[in-house]
């Protein structure tokens, strides 16, 4: 996260660390006891590592009362992603067992409604992402507020040229941005899962580059599917 | 203590501009979005919009563009909101409005002390 | 835009009394915010995200709702609840107040 600072301890009981071989590696997001939502991309990345899910975190490092680490009983990305696209950026992983719930471990309620955010609302990104263009990773979560940006504009030739389907959204990435590591994570606005930010390689903090974030919404089908 | 200190009471004529001021203090300016409100004599609050200390970003409520101008002075910790070409439907008590707390249920946390704005000629 | 209708605009009730407030969305929002304003004073923050009462709010009060429908209310009213509450949305841009709830004190 660029741009942001230090989240309320424990104020975001879904927000999850998908981690390999015991590093942090993306955000993810509980949105059921026993699944999180995450991006596809994050496997690719993961190669042959033992893939587990942090739930109940503020700091990587610390001994917390509510962290516990599920092992993944079942990765599951979109049928559709692919490598070298950014397109159906998502991941459903099934935790080993139920996640035991409690005020520092919550599912989020994601939108099912397929309409567009209205653009500059304001929207909550959180993650354990880079902090600086230097790479510097946080141990503790970060979070920042981001303006939902129009289509149209995201998707001028200055900025991502076409690129942003109606399945996606952007945020503004005026010095503050989601960036490497967050990916994954979740973009909730007024309180719901609305996106979770892709994991493409893209420029972070640039504002002719804004964050890219695959609308939960339009994968309403699939996700019941999986879920069920 | 966290505050928002609003510049004193605006007599304009109609047609005029004018420029309030929001002073924050006790907190890191740049970190937090500013927002601002009329409240109109029914008592009705209308959200005008918000500008971002760290970048300029703005957004404006379709009802207020063309109608208010929002900025800031890092340097000072201050935020600005001009009002131009005005009317006696301007006439109304202005605040600038903050969330200051880092939970991803954002509302207005802290107001500004306000400033009332007449037009009349 | 979201449209937020409060009622009942005048509240009248006794010290000791139960009162609830609502507040109406015309179209589904997933939380409310509630301010508390009194006469000269600026606008307070009172309950936040439908049900967690703001610093130094008194646990009398109470939020609750889902969906288009939400509401405010005090279990036992004290004569320093005498003010105006306004419900306000934040799921979607330009956020919007509701037109106030003005309890008077019998």
């Known amino acids: 996260i660029l741009g942001g600072r230090e989240a309320e301890a424990h104020a975001r009981p879904y927000m999850a660390s998908v981690q390999v071989n015991g590093e942090h590696l993306c955000g993810g997001v509980l949105v059921a006891e026993q699944w999180v939502l995450s991006a596809a991309h994050c496997l690719e990345d993961a190669a042959d590592g033992k893939v587990q899910v942090l739930l109940g975190a503020h700091s990587l490092s610390q001994p917390e009362p509510s962290k516990r680490l599920y092992d993944v009983l079942r990765a599951v990305p979109h049928p559709d992603s692919r490598p070298d696209t950014i397109d159906h950026d998502l991941l459903l992983l099934q935790l080993s067992e139920k996640a035991t719930l409690g005020p520092a471990v919550r599912p989020l309620p994601w939108q099912r409604v397929d309409r567009d955010v209205e653009p500059g609302t304001l929207c909550d990104v959180a993650g354990w992402g880079i902090v600086s263009h230097a790479g510097r990773r946080p141990d503790r979560l970060q979070h920042v507020l981001l303006p939902v940006l129009d289509r149209a504009t995201c998707n001028r030739r200055t900025h991502h040229d076409g690129a942003i389907t109606q399945r996606m959204m952007c945020a503004e990435s005026n010095r503050r941005d989601s960036c490497k590591g967050d990916s994954g994570g979740p973009l909730v606005c007024g309180g719901v899962l609305e996106g979770v930010v892709t994991s493409g390689s893209r420029v972070c903090g640039n504002r002719k580059k804004p964050g890219i974030y695959t609308r939960v919404a339009s994968y309403a089908a699939w996700i019941d599917s999986v879920l069920a | 203590e966290v505050q928002l200190q609003q510049s004193g009471p605006e007599l304009v004529k109609p047609g005029a501009s004018v420029k309030i001021s929001c002073k924050a203090s006790g907190y890191s300016f740049t970190d937090y979005y500013m927002h601002w409100v009329k409240q109109s004599h029914g008592n009705i609050l209308d959200w005008i919009g918000y500008?971002?200390?760290?970048?300029?970003?703005?957004s404006y409520n379709q009802k207020f563009k063309g109608k208010a101008t929002l900025s800031v002075d890092q340097s000072s910790s201050t935020a600005y909101m001009e009002l131009r070409s005005l009317t006696s439907e301007d006439s109304a008590v202005y605040y600038c409005s903050s969330y200051y707390g880092s939970s991803p249920y954002w509302y207005f946390d802290v107001w500004g002390t306000g400033t009332r704005v007449t037009v009349s000629s | 835009q979201i449209v937020l209708s409060q009622s009942p605009a005048i509240l009248s009730a006794s010290p000791g009394e139960k009162v609830t407030m609502t507040c109406r969305a015309s179209s589904s929002v997933s939380y409310m915010h509630w301010y508390q304003q009194k006469p000269g004073s600026s606008p307070k923050p009172w309950i936040y995200a439908t049900s967690n009462l703001a610093s130094g709010v008194p646990t009398r009060f109470s939020g609750s709702g889902s969906g288009t429908s939400y509401s405010l209310t005090i279990s036992k009213l004290e004569a320093e609840d005498a003010a105006t509450y306004y419900c306000q949305q934040w799921s979607s841009n330009p956020y919007t107040f509701g037109g106030g709830t003005k309890l008077e004190i019998k």
């Open positions: 500008i971002d200390p760290y970048n300029g970003v703005s």
